[in-house]
């Protein structure tokens, strides 16, 4: 009876997500058979989040809209470990929008989810950011410095990375 009601709850939760994500990949969290964490297929998972590399080339605003339609945001990178995970799935000859922008061109960078911008946890390429006209951030590969961030014009189409919280059922 308990298992039945738990299954019904899970099914209704899954239906909620079905409009955006017809398929979920779930793993058992810990030893408790009742706790499952899921990411949409084919998103990847790291810690408590799911990530999707969008290969369509769009402006920063359209990229953010595209993520939000899927219940996500452009990626907010909080740690070096998170960035190290993300770059495993990126192509070296491409650039990807992050959820980081400077809307007023005053060098006041802000994350899309309002996470406070912390200068000490940023991974800008050396000499970046460096242009008041370039108000959106990308992550890209430079042979001298590996992966890092760069400021670019927001209207220039790029690939992007979406991030959402894991779905717990």
């Amino acid at each position: 009876n308990f298992m039945y009601s738990k299954t019904v709850k899970r099914l209704s939760k899954l239906r909620e997500y079905q409009q955006y994500h017809p398929s979920l990949t779930c793993v058992m969290e810990g030893k408790d058979i009742e706790d499952w964490s899921c990411c949409p297929t084919p998103w990847t998972s790291f810690q408590s989040s799911c990530y999707f590399i969008s290969t369509g080339m769009q402006s920063w605003t359209k990229s953010q809209k595209n993520c939000s339609v899927m219940g996500a945001d452009l990626v907010v990178i909080n740690t070096r470990e998170e960035q190290d995970f993300i770059i495993q799935n990126l192509k070296r000859n491409s650039s990807y929008f992050l959820g980081l922008s400077d809307p007023g061109g005053r060098r006041h960078w802000q994350w899309v989810d309002q996470t406070p911008y912390n200068e000490n946890v940023t991974f800008w390429h050396s000499g970046e950011p460096n242009n008041l006209d370039e108000r959106c951030a990308i992550i890209n590969f430079r042979s001298s410095e590996e992966w890092g961030w760069n400021d670019i014009h927001c209207h220039v189409p790029q690939k992007s990375i979406c991030k959402m919280k894991k779905i717990y059922i």
């Epitope: 061109g105 060098r107 000499g127 460096n130 242009n131 006209d133 370039e134 209207h155």
Partner: antibody, heavy 118, light 107 residues
Framework: QVQLQQSGAELVGPGVSVKISCKGS????????MHWVKQSHAKSLEWIGV????????NYNQKFKGKATMTVDKSSSTAYMELASLTSEDSAIYFC???????????WGQGTLVTVSA | DLQMTQTPSSLSASLGDRVTISCRAS??????LSWYQEKPDGTFKLLIY???RLHSGVPSRFSGSGSGTDYSLTVRNLEQEDIGTYFC?????????FGGGTKLEIR
């Protein structure tokens, strides 16, 4: 080649306003913000502010808020700066300069001399 | 505002000399330092940006160096066309600020 052509010298009385212009050519005007710089004997060079033709927004040095107003006309690739309530302190050469990466002024106008005199 | 202190305020040198102008910032400016030349006719020209990068068309006689708060511009093999006033400018923190200028004359 990139050129910034500024309007001619102005001789004006105290208390009035003056509007000077800076026409950009040889590049895509909306891709680069325009800065304004004041050169006076007393204070050497001072950054007045910057305007983005693409976004339409401005950023002023606090010192020049209320004194300078920057605008652009995209159709003519021209940036303008209006100086209000002029006093002798405003007598100076005013330059426009194109924004570039590494926070540099890559190209400068030839300057517009503004003289405030009764 | 971030202060830029430029020294000397003027200097006189002979053709072929090597001259150095210094600029000190009131705080670390992360190499976001540019140098400009004001010609005797009042026109401005960018020489060096990001501490040591030569702007296009600028002769290699000009070089820049420095880090943190201390920066310098060096002109080797001084030529007649180098006369004018030189200014440093920081681009680390708004409002951007300039040094007071160094007037270079030929002896």
């Amino acid at each position: 080649q990139v050129q910034l052509q500024q309007s001619g010298a102005e001789l004006v009385g105290p208390g009035v306003s003056v509007k000077i212009s800076c026409k950009g050519s040889g590049y895509t005007f909306t891709d680069y913000s325009m800065h304004w710089v004041k050169q006076s004997h007393a204070k050497s060079l001072e950054w007045i502010g910057v305007i983005s033709p693409y976004y339409g927004d401005t950023n002023y040095n606090q010192k020049f808020k209320g004194k300078a107003t920057m605008t652009v006309d995209k159709s003519s690739s021209t940036a303008y700066m209006e100086l209000a309530s002029l006093t002798s302190e405003d007598s100076a050469i005013y330059f426009c300069a194109r924004n570039d990466d590494y926070y540099r002024f890559a190209y400068w106008g030839q300057g517009t001399l503004v003289t405030v005199s009764a | 505002d971030l202060q830029m202190t430029q020294t000397p305020s003027s200097l006189s040198a002979s053709l072929g000399d090597r001259v150095t102008i210094s600029c000190r910032a009131s705080q670390d400016i992360n190499n976001y330092l540019s140098w400009y030349q004001e010609k005797p006719d009042g026109t401005f020209k960018l020489l060096i940006y990001y501490t040591s990068r030569l702007h296009s068309g600028v002769p290699s006689r000009f070089s820049g160096s420095g880090s943190g708060t201390d920066y310098s511009l060096t002109v080797r093999n001084l030529e007649q066309e180098d006369i004018g006033t030189y200014f440093c400018q920081q681009g680390k923190t708004l409002p951007w600020t300039f040094g007071g200028g160094t007037k270079l004359e030929i002896r």
